[in-house]
Interface confidence: low
């Protein structure tokens, strides 16, 4: 399953590193019951399989080359030797699909699992009186989610297969040759280009990869995270794990721990600093959600955390799931605002970049016009926003995010539930009364959360005059980790919002920011601005600042300076 993917994407010196044991602190490692430890033929520890496990359910799968199981339960198989099984049955009354884990040494429905080693679940018909009966088994994670009936996979005629392979092989040789040549030329170009760029990289300057035109740059990373352009948005299916040495624990969330780490560059002492988010074995779902979000190449944006790769790590004591990303030394926005008072110019940069990041996330196209799946973050807060060295924001922690796939039904959206952090939840989320018919309503909840973050930034800006100690939104009204009920009292019953003292409005720029964020936290989701509109407003602020040409913290926007208020 894509085992060689990284060979074309990572620099060769990284690929040549072979499975170097990372130093993992003991408290991160997860123990596995002794009765679950089994070794494969090579003596490596074999971990329990992940399979779809819904037992028997009615199905609509009929007369199709392949079907999805529509089973929402991914299970850890009970024993390491178990594999994934799917059974499709049709009789006069109905069609059922069974998804389970099962030990291939034992018969299932009186049949031996002959195809247990297959990575795909390819259905084979079995003779059963009074019904049509197909069964398949496979041994890659969640492989029984996609069941394949297509004759193309039928291996029952070896002679025919031989002919197919011969014909295919001969006909593929010329294009294959061309493809290999192109890859070699491209690789040489990249290596050469990387060497030329490395000196600039050392000095910590921004690197941009220009694609399509000067106006359509995909910004690879900022001034700090020295990560080569070859290694973004990949899933590391290679058995050769990246040579990473964990350094210090820098954060701990609901589902994972985040470490500062060293990505070794080659046999020398050189390394790049990266962040590693480590999910324990049972938090696979969170890791998978975030990995799937990050894996969209069109997500790449200067205000969204740069993703390197995802890995499954097998330690002696258990399996872990890793996400490897850029590292930002300034930490998250909440920590930054706690420690620093910011200037008007800082506020403008932080606010503008935050809005641009969210606008990109919500957008259905890239800045270059390529189609992109809109995504909603659903847990926007100052601790899920990182501060880059140039004092711009980048969004992180997509564990609760949702891809607004047009194929999602209202039921699918309803099942995604009341998620997020109570303090930052929009009124309609607190009340569980979202308009699921309109995917825009999910974006409007993100905009509400963004407004609270903009208020946090503004509360620490010295342009307003007296700056109080950092306080989260509603900080004086609710306890440290408020529950949904207490937030309902504040936000719904009292229609409360964080206070905007009148002296903030003496600074015209801040006044405009406050007007903007007030429109973003409107009780009526439909009345809120879009993230794109907020980004445009910040751009106009910057433009007006340049026009007035005065120093950062002065009142400097002309009285008649009007802003576009379109949504």
């Amino acid at each position: 399953m894509g085992r060689g993917l990284l060979r074309g994407l990572w620099p060769l010196h990284i690929v040549l590193w072979t499975r170097i044991a990372s130093t993992i602190p003991p408290h991160v490692q997860k123990s596995v019951n002794n009765d679950m430890i089994v070794t494969d033929n090579n003596g490596a520890v074999k971990f329990p399989q992940l399979c779809k496990f819904c037992d028997v359910r009615f199905s609509t799968c009929d007369n199709q080359k392949s079907c999805m199981s529509n089973c929402s339960i991914t299970s850890i198989c009970e024993k390491p030797q178990e594999v994934c099984v799917a059974v499709w049955r049709k009789n006069d009354e109905n069609i059922t699909l069974e998804t389970v884990c099962h030990d291939p040494k034992l018969p299932y429905h009186d049949f031996i699992l002959e195809d247990a080693a297959s990575p795909k679940c390819i259905m084979k018909e079995k003779k059963k009186p009074g019904e049509t009966f197909f069964m398949c088994s496979c041994s890659s994670d969640e492989c029984n989610d996609n069941i394949i009936f297509s004759e193309e996979y039928n291996t029952s005629n070896p002679d025919l297969l031989l002919v197919i392979f011969q014909v295919t092989g001969i006909s593929l040789l010329p294009p294959l040759g061309v493809a290999i040549s192109v890859i070699i030329i491209f690789y040489c170009y990249r290596v050469n280009r990387q060497q030329k760029l490395s000196s600039t990289w050392e000095t910590g300057k921004t690197r941009k990869l220009m694609e399509f035109s000067e106006h359509c740059a995909i910004i690879l990373e900022d001034d700090r995270s020295d990560i080569s352009s070859t290694c973004a948005n990949n899933i590391n299916h290679n058995t050769e794990l990246l040579p990473i040495e964990l350094d210090t624990l820098v954060g701990k969330g609901r589902f994972a721990e985040v470490y500062k780490a060293k990505l070794k560059q080659n046999t020398s002492e050189q390394f790049e600093t990266v962040a590693v988010k480590i999910f324990p074995y049972e938090e696979y779902a969170s890791w998978k959600t975030e990995k799937d979000i990050f894996s969209d190449i069109n997500l790449k944006h200067e205000n969204i955390l740069q993703f390197l790769t995802a890995e499954e790590r097998k330690t002696e004591l258990g399996k872990q799931y890793w996400l490897i990303t850029a590292f930002h030394a300034k930490g998250n926005l909440q920590e930054y605002l706690t420690r620093h008072v910011i200037s008007w110019e800082d506020l403008r940069k932080l606010g503008s970049s935050l809005a641009r990041g969210i606008a990109h996330l919500h957008s259905d196209h890239t800045p270059c016009g390529r189609p992109k799946m809109p995504i909603v973050h659903r847990d926007l807060k100052s601790s899920n926003i990182l501060v880059k060295n140039d004092l711009t924001c980048c969004l992180c922690d997509f564990g609760l995010s949702l891809r607004l796939d047009p194929t999602l039904s209202v039921d699918d959206l309803a099942n995604s539930g009341q998620v997020g952090t109570a303090r930052y939840m929009a009124p309609e989320v607190l009340e569980s009364r979202m308009n699921l018919e309109n995917v825009e309503s999910f974006k409007q909840t993100d905009v509400y959360s963004m407004a609270l973050v903009l208020w946090e930034m503004t509360s620490r800006c010295n342009a307003v005059g007296e700056v109080k100690d950092y306080e989260p939104p509603f900080g004086s009204k609710v306890r440290e980790h408020p529950c949904v009920e207490s937030m309902k009292d504040n936000v719904l019953r009292d229609r409360g919002r964080p206070e905007i003292p009148s002296f903030w409005l003496n600074h015209q720029g801040i006044q405009m920011v406050c007007e903007t964020l007030t429109e973003c936290w409107d009780h009526d989701p439909e009345a809120r601005l879009t993230a794109q509109c907020v980004a445009e407003r910040f751009s106009e602020l910057e433009h007006l600042d340049r026009l007035s040409g005065r120093s950062c913290s002065e009142e400097k926007i002309p009285e008649d300076g009007s802003l576009n208020t379109t949504k």
Partner: nanobody
């Protein structure tokens, strides 16, 4: 497969405490996430608290946060729900349920649970 046997319900005065237990039979108990649900007469079954297989992650309904505590002892194949500061609203039949599904965002959905205890009555007067 796992079988769940519940104990520990009863009648208690408002403000009092109870401890519910959920005993599991079967191997590899530590790969099962356990969730407590409750069902009051004439109402739907509602989520109360959940704990992942390793016990690293717990989750509570807002209505019980700070009052109820879920814990597990994998050596004994037991999961416990400690009920403190009980209110009349807490009166219900309490069920423990097990799933091999990963913890994540579906813990509150009863359809994800393949294995259920028999239920135990908690009455707060």
């Amino acid at each position: 497969q796992v079988q769940l046997q519940q104990s520990g319900g009863g009648l208690v005065q408002a403000g009092g405490s109870l401890r519910l237990a959920c005993a599991a039979s079967g191997r590899s108990f530590s790969i099962y996430g356990i969730t407590w649900f409750r069902q009051a007469p004439g109402k739907e079954r509602e989520f109360v608290a959940a704990i992942t297989g390793s016990g690293l992650t717990t989750n509570y309904a807002d209505s019980v946060k700070g009052r109820f505590t879920i814990s597990r002892d994998n050596a004994k194949n037991m999961v416990y729900l400690q009920l403190n500061s009980l209110k009349p609203d807490d009166t219900a039949v309490y069920y423990c349920a097990a799933t091999r599904a990963y913890s994540g965002y579906y813990g509150e959905n009863p359809t994800r649970y393949a294995y259920w205890g028999q239920g135990t009555q908690v009455t707060v007067s």
